[in-house]
Interface confidence: medium
């Protein structure tokens, strides 16, 4: 007697590992014979698909070697046109051993940046990822996380995170690891110990010495008044990362000496600077030709501005320099109590520089005029604003003369880097804080420097500390 | 000595893309920026874009924005510009140059070196 | 955009005459104006940078000056070498524009 199809097995769900074979089967009972069809995920898997294997009049079906993609749910329905047409489906899960799809690799690192090692792994079940860093499994803590795509990420990167590190990434059908890579850990040039100055006599030997560490090594240069060191000899030695360099100097003038300690990270440098200062007992009284001397600056408000010990020029046309030169600054620094704090340490800067300009030791001691350029960038980019209200008050007659001529620099008059880059003296606060600055180029000087955020209040000394440390 | 040269122009079709390359020597790239320029056969200077190493920042004319890409590899010490979905009227040659200083005052000191400059053709 | 119009587009002038180029900017904008000079089939060569810094190797009859939005390039004595186009170019703005040309010919 005819009989409508009843599924006598239904489907049920099939685990199956990538590259293996995986079957349903879908047993019936009907007269006359019925005709079984198979679909994955609603779409009928044609009879010639050789990706699949169709038996027992249908009701076997295997999938040869099963992908990642054949994840979903598979029905069988028969048919023998006797009753209705009768449905069984069952889900396929493709597990999958832990694969690594996206391995970490050698990493060098500034310390005190983030370091990110990549992970990123498959697998079914999800694997979990864990780290190793030599030996040991590796713990997290407050700096050192393992991300949920399995990265791990290390905030702050300290010496001692340096080392070898691999991934782990596990499931329940097994372990893989990843190739062992190196987190090198790159530390910024630092003097330890800077040269001293010293008062003595015409004719005397000297020794400065200079300690700086740093990975890798630094290398150390000296600079004597700003080119390099033409006479003395040098004797270096290295030890644990630290270099130790000692200049000896037969002194028969004054100078400024500077131990640049500078080492390589990538292809950018990182540079500290220390200075001492060589004075002859005697030498720095002005003679009647010089304009002025140079000195040690020993004022008060422009303390956070110049390098500490910066040698500074002097006046002589004033009766008091120091007195003089530093009331000037003391009046100009009180008009910037009102300007905005974008303008302001910038302001600060070519203030204490032009009116204590950097100074040039020598027969004849040479004060050395601020960049033009960098004039320029305080007039027209940071102090637009400020600088025509300032312009403004010196034609009103607001301000004395001689004020107006030592405040404000006529920026067009000052030598340009392009002439010759140690015959003017920079701005050492713009150079410090370049990455701060979000809007450039400069916007157009009817848009101010309001467009800059994250530049220092003038509390900060971040830029003028000395030793001083910036990246070139 | 400073040098900037300029490579990968050539003849492409309308909708094609390009890439051009400017390898630089003699300075400090990274303390640089390069822009790239280009003069279509008897015109003018057109500025197309620019990036400031430093700070890693681009800059395009609206001619060309979202069609071209610069790029710098500061290891490399080459600049790039991805010239895709190219017109007839990009048809120039272009050339690379930089501008030097220091982040801030970079705009003050104009394009000091220029590369020979590379022929773009966009034609069917 | 700030435009930089030039003028004027061509001149005729001899040897040994002074010859003046403007460049109006559509806006108010900084000092970072440069002028080039530009011969036929070579790159463009930097004249004058921050709107009147003479860039090293330049000659001295080579000058540039700012007046408001208005920016000057003056030879001083024309030379048979200074025949050749001129274009000023602003980077006041994240936008750069150059001036259309001026094409200094032998009268």
């Known amino acids: 007697l005819p009989k409508a199809p009843v599924i006598t097995t239904p489907l049920e769900t099939v685990d199956a590992l990538v590259e293996e074979v995986a079957t349903f089967m879908c047993a019936v009972e009907s007269y006359p014979q019925p005709e079984i069809s198979w679909t994955r995920n609603k779409i009928l898997i044609k009879l010639f698909d050789t990706r699949y294997s169709i038996r027992e009049n249908g009701q076997l079906l295997t999938i040869l070697s099963v992908e990642d993609s054949d994840d979903g749910i598979y029905c069988c329905t028969a048919n023998n046109g006797v009753g209705g047409a009768v449905e069984s489906c069952g889900a396929l899960q493709v597990k999958m051993k832990p694969k690594i799809t996206r391995p970490p690799i050698n990493v060098k690192i500034i310390e005190g940046l983030k370091a990110v090692l990549p992970c990123t792994t498959m697998g079914n079940p999800k694997p979990s990822v864990s780290w190793i860093k030599g030996d040991s499994p590796l713990r997290e803590n407050s700096r050192i996380a393992v991300l949920e795509s399995g990265s791990l990420r290390i905030h702050n990167v300290q010496k001692e995170d340096a080392g070898q590190y691999r991934c782990v990434a596990k499931n329940s059908l097994g372990t893989a690891y990843s190739k062992v890579v190196k987190l090198e850990v790159e530390v910024f040039a630092r003097i330890l110990r800077a040269p001293e100055s010293h008062n003595v006599t015409f004719g005397s030997f000297v020794t400065l010495h200079c300690t700086a560490t740093g990975i890798p090594v630094p290398t150390i240069t000296w600079i004597e008044n700003g080119n390099a060191v033409s006479s003395g000899s040098i004797q270096e030695s290295v030890k644990d990362r630290v270099i130790d360099s000692r200049l000896q100097l037969f002194i028969t003038k004054p100078g400024l000496y500077t131990c640049i300690a500078t080492n390589k990270h990538g292809e950018k440098f990182s540079t500290a600077k220390a200075a001492a200062t060589i004075s002859i007992a005697e030498w720095s009284k002005p003679q009647k030709d010089n304009k002025g001397y140079c000195a040690q600056y020993r004022g008060e408000v422009c303390n956070a501005v110049l390098a500490k010990d910066a040698l500074v020029f002097l006046n002589t046309s004033y009766a008091d320099p120091e007195e003089a030169q530093e009331l000037l600054v003391h009046t100009a620094w009180n008009e910037l109590k009102v300007v905005s704090p974008v303008c302001r340490p910038a302001a600060e800067a070519l203030l204490c520089n032009h009116i204590f300009q950097e100074c040039s030791p020598g027969v004849v001691p040479t004060p050395i005029p601020i960049c033009r350029e960098y004039c320029l960038a305080v007039k027209e980019l940071f102090c637009a604003k400020e600088w025509l209200v300032m312009e403004e008050k010196t034609h009103r007659g607001l301000y004395r003369s001689e004020m107006h001529l030592l405040s404000v620099p006529e920026c067009s008059k000052l030598p340009s880097m392009h002439w010759d880059p140690t015959a003017c003296a920079r701005l050492p606060h713009l150079d410090y804080n370049k990455e701060n600055l979000k809007t450039f180029p400069p916007m157009t000087s009817s848009k101010p420097s309001v467009d800059i955020p994250n530049l220092p209040s003038s509390s900060s000394s971040s830029f003028s500390v000395s030793p001083t440390y910036s990246m070139t | 000595e400073v040098q900037l040269v300029e490579s990968g122009g050539g003849l492409v079709q309308p909708g094609g893309s390009l890439r051009l390359s400017c390898a630089a020597s003699?300075?400090?790239?990274?303390?640089?920026?390069i822009h790239w320029v280009r003069q279509a056969p008897g015109k003018g200077l057109e500025w197309v874009a620019s990036?400031?190493?430093?700070?890693?920042?681009?800059y395009y004319a609206d001619s060309v924005k979202g069609r071209f890409t610069i790029s710098a590899d500061t290891s490399k010490n080459t600049a790039y510009l991805q010239m895709n979905s190219l017109r007839a009227e990009d048809t120039a040659v272009y050339y690379c140059?930089?501008?030097?200083?220091?982040?801030?005052?970079?705009?003050?000191?104009?394009?000091?070196?220029w590369g020979q400059g590379t022929l773009v053709t966009v034609s069917s | 955009d700030i435009q930089m119009t030039q003028s004027p587009s061509s001149l005729s002038a001899s040897v040994g005459d002074r010859v003046t180029i403007t460049c109006r900017a559509s806006?108010?904008?900084?000092?970072?104006v440069a002028w080039y000079q530009q011969k036929p089939g070579k790159a463009p060569k930097l004249l004058i940078y921050?709107?009147?810094s003479l860039y090293s190797g330049v000659p001295s009859r080579f000058s540039g000056s700012r007046s408001g939005t208005d920016f000057t390039l003056t030879i001083s004595s024309l030379q048979p070498e200074d025949f050749a186009t001129y274009y000023c170019q602003q980077s006041s703005s994240s936008l750069i524009t150059f001036g259309q040309g001026t094409k200094v010919e032998i009268k």
């Open positions: 990036i400031y190493s430093s700070s890693g920042s681009t």
């Open positions: 003699g300075f400090t790239f990274s303390s640089s920026s």
């Open positions: 806006q108010s904008v900084s000092s970072a």
């Open positions: 921050s709107a009147s």
């Open positions: 140059a930089r501008s030097g200083g220091e982040f801030y005052i970079t705009s003050y000191y104009g394009m000091d070196y």
